[in-house]
Amino acid sequence: CPTSCKCSASRIWCSDPSPGIVAFPRLEPNSVDPENITEIFIANQKRLEIINEDDVEAYVGLRNLTIVDSGLKFVAHKAFLKNSNLQHINFTRNKLTSLSRKHFRHLDLSELILVGNPFTCSCDIMWIKTLQEAKSSPDTQDLYCLNESSKNIPLANLQIPNCGLPSANLAAPNLTVEEGKSITLSCSVAGDPVPNMYWDVGNLVSKHMNETSHTQGSLRITNISSDDSGKQISCVAENLVGEDQDSVNLTVHFAPTITFLESPTSDHHWCIPFTVKGNPKPALQWFYNGAILNESKYICTKIHVTNHTEYHGCLQLDNPTHMNNGDYTLIAKNEYGKDEKQISAHFMGWPGIDDGANPNYPDVIYEDYGTAANDIGDTTNRSNEIPSTDVTDKTGREH
């Protein structure tokens, strides 16, 4: 632990002004693991003037950083690049004349306290004012900058011409695209100071390339993958003061695929589990031994999880018997195509026959509408009857 400091497994605090520290505290190689340090508290260190790029990087678990009543004049731009857990920074009463938002833009800070620093009045610090105004909490800090006569001017009363938030404007065509096709997005940015623009495509799978000038840019996405449906694409304008973004959601239309269809499992009900992907939402139709299966309250499709264009569900059967054994085929269909898969279901053996004998499936299904417990509806093949079984439950709601 450095002189003038005390260290524990999770904290470093340096508040003794004599002899004091002249550099950001670093731990000896064989002492406490810096990754476990969550709080660093520094006070009364008039000779501590700089935080270098590599001073804080070892403290990846750091959540609270306090440097107060000290001599801090300069913070390197990438000083906190590796400290993604930082939530509270307090630089009260130091010697900071300027501070860039680039230090903090990647952090999700809940508190940044900068009171009592001799900031120079300039566009460089207007992001702090913008941040303050955006927070609009009752405990706003009284932040000042120094004018040409070295007098304190409240940031709240400061106006800087040609120093404002930028704007981004995304001119997107209809962002509903068929799988495999290509699309080009255009974006224009404006602002003073002139902003930089960049594209934020998140984890886009499809191949993409951008062309960007200062105020105009285009993003071409080729051979669009169905995996990108629902992804957000943003055009971001950024300058000294802050950033603005305009976003669009990509909708990819594609033919259905049944990615999963398994033999029945028994829980509260019997369930033939399936997963279907498709956009627009596919209509589902079940066949039993080659004939349309008209659903009823005893045998029906239930969607349990919808994940954008992927639907996880069951063909749910209430108390099926040997009468329900057979081949179940799921057909998923939308305007871009269809897919089908089949499984064989064996719920129970025929009465009087050993369950393990696995007899042939019956050629005749008894249409015993009075037997509610195993009523699976009319299974004769009436080709003029194709009920719409859109992926909803009986109440018409998606799950």
Partner: antibody, heavy 118, light 112 residues
Framework: DVKLVESGGGLVKPGGSLKLSCAAS????????MSWVRQTPEKRLEWVAT????????YFPDSVKGRFTMSRDNAKNALYLQMSSLKSEDTAMYYC???????????WGQGTTLTVSS | DVLMTQTPLSLPVSLGDQASISCRSS???????????LEWYLQKPGQSPNLLIY???NRFSGVPDRFSGSGSGTDFTLKISRVEAEDLGVYYC?????????FGGGTKLEIT
């Protein structure tokens, strides 16, 4: 000899706008912070606005913040005060002043009168 | 805001007499940089105000040495050792230490 000459005052209705000008001579205008100070009919003085030497920032008291803007043209040795959403309490004599490097108002113009009345 | 209170409101003096004007601030006006931005201005009848004293006690160029300023913290005084006819007018104190900067209400120096 330092000289500051204001112009542009007049009679304006409440809610109206007006732009005051100040022509400076006798010193290197672009090196000095400039301010506007007003004097009410009751003879009270009130600081109103300040602009830095390069025109890169301005500041105002809360009483005029958001309604007044201040600008300068260093090539023309000119200072401006754009006033909008005027109120009767803005009625005053408006003085253009030079700020010394120490922050005091070391030179004043002769003033221009603004009257806000319906 | 810092309130600057001047007394008296009106000060009748005879030529050659000493005059003293008081200015009291509602809070300490020492700036964080150590300076005290306390100024005195004189507005002669029909004219614009003119700077007399800056930083409590420094005379502006061309101001006669019969004018002197003193004080600290919250209490400040302008003294005119031997009043002359050209000194009549309204005297204003001003603080430029704490934003927003404020003037006192003025003291009218009248010759009796």
């Amino acid at each position: 000899d330092v000289k500051l000459v204001e112009s542009g005052g007049g009679l304006v209705k409440p809610g109206g706008s007006l732009k005051l000008s100040c022509a400076a001579s006798g010193f290197t205008f672009s090196s000095y912070t400039m301010s506007w100070v007003r004097q009410t009919p009751e003879k009270r003085l009130e600081w109103v606005a300040t602009i830095s030497s390069g025109g890169d920032y301005t500041y105002f008291p809360d009483s005029v913040k958001g309604r007044f803007t201040m600008s300068r043209d260093n090539a023309k040795n000119a200072l401006y005060l754009q006033m909008s959403s005027l109120k009767s309490e803005d009625t005053a004599m408006y003085y253009c002043t030079r700020e010394s490097g120490r922050g005091d108002f070391d030179y004043w113009g002769q003033g221009t009168t603004l009257t806000v009345s319906s | 805001d810092v309130l600057m209170t001047q007394t008296p409101l009106s000060l009748p003096v005879s030529l050659g007499d000493q005059a003293s004007i008081s200015c009291r601030s509602s809070q300490n006006i020492v700036h964080s940089n150590g300076n005290t931005y306390l100024e005195w201005y004189l507005q002669k009848p029909g004219q614009s105000p003119n700077l007399l004293i800056y930083n409590v006690s420094n005379r502006f160029s061309g101001v006669p040495d019969r004018f002197s300023g003193s004080g600290s913290g919250t209490d400040f005084t302008l003294k005119i050792s031997r009043v002359e006819a050209e000194d009549l007018g309204v005297y204003y104190c001003f603080q430029g230490s704490h934003f927003p900067w404020t003037f006192g209400g003025g003291t009218k120096l009248e010759i009796t």
